[in-house]
Interface confidence: low
């Protein structure tokens, strides 16, 4: 449906407080150095010149294209070249090139300070003097930092975010309200933030049939009631919004996600039973809520998967005939029956599936060839199982932190040369894997273990590809997107790493860490385990655990001193001292 | 899964000429810092030079600057070695690796490269 001027379609469709704040979002997305009055005042002009184009779509330079204006307008930042470098060069391209350009240039891991909460009282008071500014001021935080984040989804925590300022600022006790509500809303917006960066890294470097596939395990598992047409049209359509997001169409993508909960909402007597309450709720709730769904109940008495896709005489035919569609099938029936199986896994078992077909339907007897495919699905089965049950167990043992002390050796011996900045980051999260999912019935562990760990892993993937220095992080990130797991869980200690040679001011530590919360003050210590491992990478467990447990009572102890830096100083170099002495340095 | 197949090599005599391809597939190319990196027999591998992902910033091996000319065309996923006034020393098997790496990315088997008159 051509529309004589994008802008104007876009802006009547999304309305005028959507459209501002989703062009801020797309802007602090490509410029993520820039400061806030700058893009603020760009949106402004935008804005402007959407308002004539809704007046007259006539209009001069109505008719270009969004991505065509919003490029012309980020160019004319003046201070292009020496914020940005060769970025400036984008500038000198066309479109198409020229937004494929700025896409290639953001940055997972921008050089920006970390934020820091200021008094509940400040904020409160920033909240009432200018509420537009205040809100506006926390969609480009959150959007410059998280260059991927699902600008539709970040609407909705920003809509949350006001409500629990609005709420909590005229409470008897301000604080007690509102920061438990900041850190959930923080550490849901980092788990959203990693959840769609895997998304667009399924699209981007391994294309949209890898993305189909999740998308049909996915919500085939989520809406097994629905028929295979109805799945399928719903992959076609969140494959398009998850597109237009991932390449920077963010007004397209919001409009597009908008009309596709609106068609579920319709149509939800064929999905799902369990899409009532959602559809009640208001847009950017109703759609965030669809995404959350539980799973719907399976039918009864479905039949055996075998009789379609082994016993059939007609699975070559069928395969040869259409061969994704036919695989589309399989996965579609497969993923409704194993809730209690991850997307990842589901797709390994499809693609050993695809495997068998390509050889067998070439051979003299197809039949007698693949009639034992199914068997070829236990051990993939199996693996993941004992993988979490074996971890399960392990932090049951050891509690979140040292469960993720005992992730961060491991995999600081796979890959030493990885920044130690980033082996803290990905380790703590994959160790948060067991307060997240080790507490689930067997049924919901592998789903939410493995999927969430695929997410965790391209963090590290991202992280990496921006400097890369380990061909075996390269190599897990870049062969297959549903093997990264097991290719990291099958990597051993790196035999070819050359120790990093001992440096006592990374073991210097001041009276600062004693002010520090638990976590920071966590993070400090598994900084300085995993350099410990990268100095002695065949340093053994009892080793690490005795230096460890040396350090935090080092800590503790200077932290009561009446003179903590003396302390520090003086404690701390009888700790290097004992350090190297108990690892051999 | 990652491919990068070497070629461009063969024998040539002191003071030669050679230019190395590598074609790169299996993997998003131009986002992705390269190397070449050389083994000669019994010796363990060197990296000769590394580019950039986008190719703005070059490194040579003290015993290749001045002779040798790394670049890439992201276009068509391929890393180059221009190699100009070849030395018998510059003999050894010749391969591109992802990164600063100077162990093999890919299943590719190297390109030889012998001086001699």
């Known amino acids: 449906d051509a529309h004589k001027s994008e802008v104007a379609h876009r802006f009547k469709d999304l309305g005028e407080e959507n459209f501002k704040a989703l062009v801020l979002i797309a802007f602090a997305q490509y410029l993520q150095q820039c400061p806030f009055e700058d893009h603020v005042k760009l949106v402004n002009e935008v804005t402007e010149f959407a308002k004539t184009c809704v007046a007259d779509e006539s209009a001069e330079n109505c008719d270009k294209s969004l991505h065509t204006l919003f490029g012309d307008k980020l160019c004319t930042v003046a201070t292009l070249r020496e914020t940005y470098g060769e970025m400036a060069d984008c500038c000198a391209k066309q479109e198409p090139e020229r937004n494929e350009c700025f896409l290639q240039h953001k940055d997972d891991n921008p050089n920006l300070p970390r934020l820091v909460r200021p008094e509940v009282d400040v904020m409160c008071t920033a909240f009432h003097d200018n509420e537009e500014t205040f809100l506006k001021k926390y969609l480009y935080e959150i959007a410059r930092r998280h260059p991927y984040f699902y600008a539709p989804e970040l609407l909705f925590f920003a809509k949350r975010y006001k409500a629990a300022f609005t709420e909590c600022c005229q409470a008897a006790d301000k604080a007690a309200c509102l920061l438990p509500k900041l850190d959930e809303l923080r550490d849901e917006g980092k788990a959203s933030s990693a959840k769609q960066r895997l998304k667009c890294a399924s699209l981007q470097k391994f294309g949209e049939r890898a993305f189909k596939a999740w998308a049909v395990a996915r919500l085939s598992q989520r809406f097994p009631k629905a028929e295979f047409a109805e799945v399928s049209k719903l992959v076609t359509d969140l494959t398009k919004v998850h597109t237009e997001c991932c390449h920077g169409d963010l007004l397209e993508c919001a409009d597009d996600r908008a009309d596709l909960a609106k068609y579920i909402c319709e149509n939800q007597d064929s999905i799902s039973s369990k899409l009532k309450e959602c559809c009640e709720k208001p847009l950017l709730e109703k759609s965030h809520c669809i995404a959350e769904v539980e799973n719907d109940e399976m039918p009864a008495d479905l039949p055996s998967l075998a009789a379609d896709f082994v016993e059939s005489k007609d699975v070559c035919k069928n395969y040869a005939e259409a061969k994704d569609v036919f695989l589309g099938m399989f996965l579609y029936e497969y993923a409704r029956r194993h809730p209690d199986y991850s997307v990842v896994l589901l797709l390994r078992l499809a693609k050993t599936y695809e495997t068998t077909l390509e050889k067998c339907c070439a051979a003299a007897d197809p039949h007698e060839c693949y009639a034992k495919v199914f068997d070829e699905f236990k051990p993939l089965v199996e693996e993941p199982q004992n993988l979490i049950k074996q971890n399960c167990e392990l932090f049951e043992q050891l509690g979140e932190y040292k469960f993720q002390n005992a992730l961060l050796v491991r995999y600081t011996k796979k890959v030493p040369q990885v920044s130690t900045p980033t082996l803290v980051e990905v380790s703590r999260n994959l160790g948060k894997v067991g307060s997240k999912c080790c507490k689930h019935p067997e049924a919901k562990r592998m789903p939410c273990a493995e999927d969430y760990l695929s997410v965790v892993l391209n963090q590290l993937c991202v992280l990496h590809e921006k400097t890369p220095v380990s061909d075996r992080v390269t190599k897990c990130c870049t062969e297959s997107l549903v093997n990264r797991r097991p290719c990291f869980s099958a990597l051993e200690v790196d035999e070819t790493y050359v120790p990093k040679e001992f440096n006592a001011e990374t073991f210097t530590f001041h009276a600062d860490i004693c002010t520090l919360s638990e976590k920071e003050r966590q993070i400090k210590k598994q900084t300085a385990l995993v350099e410990l491992v990268k100095h002695k990478p065949k340093a053994t467990k009892e080793q690490l655990k005795a230096v460890m447990d040396d350090f935090a009572a080092f800590v503790e102890k200077c932290c009561k001193a009446d003179d903590k830096e003396t302390c520090f100083a003086e404690e701390g170099k009888k700790l290097v001292a004992a350090s190297q002495a108990a690892l051999g340095l | 899964q990652v491919q990068l197949v070497e070629s461009g090599g063969g024998l040539v005599q002191p003071g030669g000429s050679l230019r190395l391809s590598c074609a790169a597939s299996?993997?998003?190319?131009?986002?992705?810092?390269m190397s070449w990196v050389r083994q000669a027999p019994a010796k363990g591998p060197e990296r000769v030079s590394a580019?950039?992902?986008?190719?703005?910033?070059?490194i040579y091996a003290d015993s290749v600057k001045g002779r040798f000319t790394i670049s890439r065309d992201n276009a068509k996923n391929t890393l180059y070695l221009q190699m100009n006034s070849l030395k018998p020393e510059d003999t050894a098997v010749y391969y591109c690796?992802?990164?600063?790496?100077?162990?093999?990315?890919?299943p590719g088997q190297g390109t030889q490269v012998t001086v001699s008159s």
């Open positions: 690796t992802i990164g600063s790496s100077t162990t093999p990315s890919g």
């Open positions: 580019i950039s992902s986008d190719a703005s910033g070059t």
């Open positions: 299996g993997f998003t190319f131009g986002q992705f810092g």
